[in-house]
Interface confidence: medium
C-alpha cells in the first residue's frame, strides 16, 4: 500500500530512508538537458522473495541535446501522484541485507541522473531526520517518522525534531 | 545485541593527531546515531559530538570544533574519531557509544581508547 | 547550551540504605534524562532513559523520577555492587551534557 503523503517536513532538516520495503517506487529522473531512453523504465521498484530484495529495472538517460531542454517531468505512476523528494547524495555502502529482510539498498546511481531522488513510499516505510548544517537539534528524538496505516488511510507520525539556527 | 569495539591505546606527542576507530557488531549500524565521549583522569563525562551513518555529516561540541573530525564508513561498520593539535590535557580515555536516535540515551559503549599526550 | 548539576557530588551509604541523587538542568529538558552507572576502570552503563524508563537488564530498585528541570535517581536498596559513580545526562539538545557525577561510597 503506497503512503498518500509525503514525510513531515521539518524546516531546516533532511529526511532519509535507510533502507527501502518492498513495494517502494523511484522515479527515473534525469537531469537538465537528458531525458529517459525511448522505451525506459519510468521508475526502479524495490521488490524481493523473503530472503532477498533488489530494484527492479533500470534507469536510463540520454541527452536530449535534439528536443528541447526544458525540464523533464516524468509521467507518474497511476496508483500515486505524491512527490516525495531525497536529496541525490554519494551511493553509500547500505546495512546488511540480513538485517533488514524485504527491504531494498539505497540504489547506485545511474548516468546524468536528476540531484533530487522522487521515491513513493509504502505503508510501515520509516524515514530519519537530521538538522542541515549550521543547524542544530532541539528535542533530540525521536528524529524518525513512520508510513502508518489507520482507519483505511495512511498517514505519517510526526518526529520529534526542531532544529534552532 | 551490538557490541563497539574501539582501537587501541595511543601515546602521543604534543601538537600531533591520533585517530581513533569504533567498529560496530551485531546489529545495523547506520540507524543509529554514534557519539563520541572522553573521560579525563578523574574527571566526568564529556560529550565531544556525533555522527549518523546515513547522513555522514557530524555534530561537534563547541569546544572541540575545528580540532575533531568524526566519521563514518557504513562499508565496514566503523566510526572514527580524529583530534588534531594534541596537548597535555588530552590525555582522557575516549569512548563511542551508539544513541538511538538521540533519545533513548547512549545504551551501547565501546570499551574505551586510552590517548596519552606526553613529550 | 543546557547546563546539568549533580547533587551531592559524593555519598556514604550502606548496603541495604535507599539513596537518592538528584539532577537540575539550567533550563526545561522535559523528560530528555538518562541516567548512568560507572564503575573504575569501565565504561559507563545506561541504568534509566527518559526521566523514567528502566534500561532492559537492570535491576528493578533503580528508579528514576522527574520532568522539566529536576530530576531524582533512587536505589530503594543498596547492593554491594551498586558503589559507584553516576552520572545524569540530558538528550534534550545539542550538545548533550552529563551532569558532574555523582561517586557512591560505602560507609
Known amino acids: 500500500e503506497l503512503c498518500d503523503d509525503d514525510p513531515p517536513e521539518i524546516p531546516h532538516a533532511t529526511f532519509k530512508a535507510m533502507a527501502y520495503k518492498e513495494g517502494t517506487m523511484l522515479n527515473c529522473e534525469c537531469k537538465r538537458g537528458f531525458r529517459r531512453i525511448k522505451s525506459g523504465s519510468l521508475y526502479m521498484l524495490c521488490t524481493g522473495s523473503s530472503s532477498h530484495s533488489s530494484w527492479d529495472n533500470q534507469c536510463q538517460c540520454t541527452s536530449s541535446a535534439t528536443r528541447s531542454t526544458t525540464k523533464q517531468v516524468t509521467p507518474q505512476p497511476e496508483e500515486q501522484k505524491e512527490r516525495k523528494t531525497t536529496e541525490m547524495q554519494s551511493p553509500m555502502q547500505p546495512v546488511d541485507q540480513a538485517s533488514l529482510p524485504g527491504h531494498c539498498r539505497e540504489p547506485p546511481p545511474w548516468e546524468n541522473e536528476a540531484t533530487e531522488r522522487i521515491y513513493h513510499f509504502v505503508v510501515g516505510q520509516m524515514v530519519y531526520y537530521q538538522c542541515v548544517q549550521g543547524y542544530r537539534a532541539l528535542h533530540r528524538g525521536p528524529a524518525e517518522s513512520v508510513c502508518k496505516m489507520t482507519h483505511g488511510k495512511t498517514r505519517w507520525t510526526q518526529p520529534q525534531l526542531i532544529c534552532t539556527g | 545485541q551490538m557490541q563497539l569495539v574501539q582501537s587501541g591505546a595511543e601515546v602521543k606527542k604534543p601538537g600531533s593527531s591520533v585517530k581513533v576507530s569504533c567498529k560496530a557488531s551485531?546489529?545495523?549500524?547506520?540507524?543509529?546515531?554514534i557519539s563520541w565521549v572522553r573521560q579525563a583522569p578523574g574527571q566526568g563525562l564529556e560529550w565531544m559530538g556525533g555522527?549518523?551513518?546515513?547522513?555522514?555529516?557530524?555534530n561537534y561540541a563547541q569546544k572541540f570544533q575545528g580540532r575533531v573530525t568524526i566519521t563514518a564508513d557504513e562499508s565496514t561498520s566503523t566510526a572514527y574519531m580524529e583530534l588534531s593539535s594534541l596537548r597535555s590535557e588530552d590525555t582522557a580515555v575516549y569512548y563511542c557509544a551508539r544513541e538511538m536516535y538521540y533519545y533513548y540515551g547512549m545504551d551501547v559503549w565501546g570499551q574505551g581508547t586510552t590517548v596519552t599526550v606526553s613529550s | 547550551d543546557i547546563q546539568m548539576t549533580q547533587s551531592p557530588s559524593s555519598l556514604s551509604a550502606s548496603v541495604g540504605d535507599r539513596v537518592t541523587i538528584t539532577c537540575r538542568a539550567s533550563q526545561s529538558i522535559s523528560s530528555y534524562l538518562n541516567w548512568y552507572q560507572q564503575k573504575p576502570g569501565k565504561a559507563p552503563k545506561l541504568l534509566i532513559y527518559?526521566?523514567?524508563s528502566l534500561q532492559s537488564g537492570v535491576p528493578s530498585r533503580f528508579s528514576g523520577s522527574g520532568s522539566g528541570t529536576d530530576f531524582t535517581l533512587t536505589i530503594s536498596s543498596l547492593q554491594p555492587e551498586d558503589f559507584a559513580t553516576y552520572y545524569c545526562q540530558q538528550s534534550y539538545s545539542t550538545p548533550p551534557a552529563f551532569g558532574q557525577g555523582t561517586k557512591l561510597e560505602i560507609k
Open positions: 551485531g546489529g545495523t549500524f547506520s540507524s543509529y546515531a
Open positions: 555522527i549518523i551513518p546515513i547522513f555522514g555529516t557530524a
Open positions: 527518559a526521566a523514567s
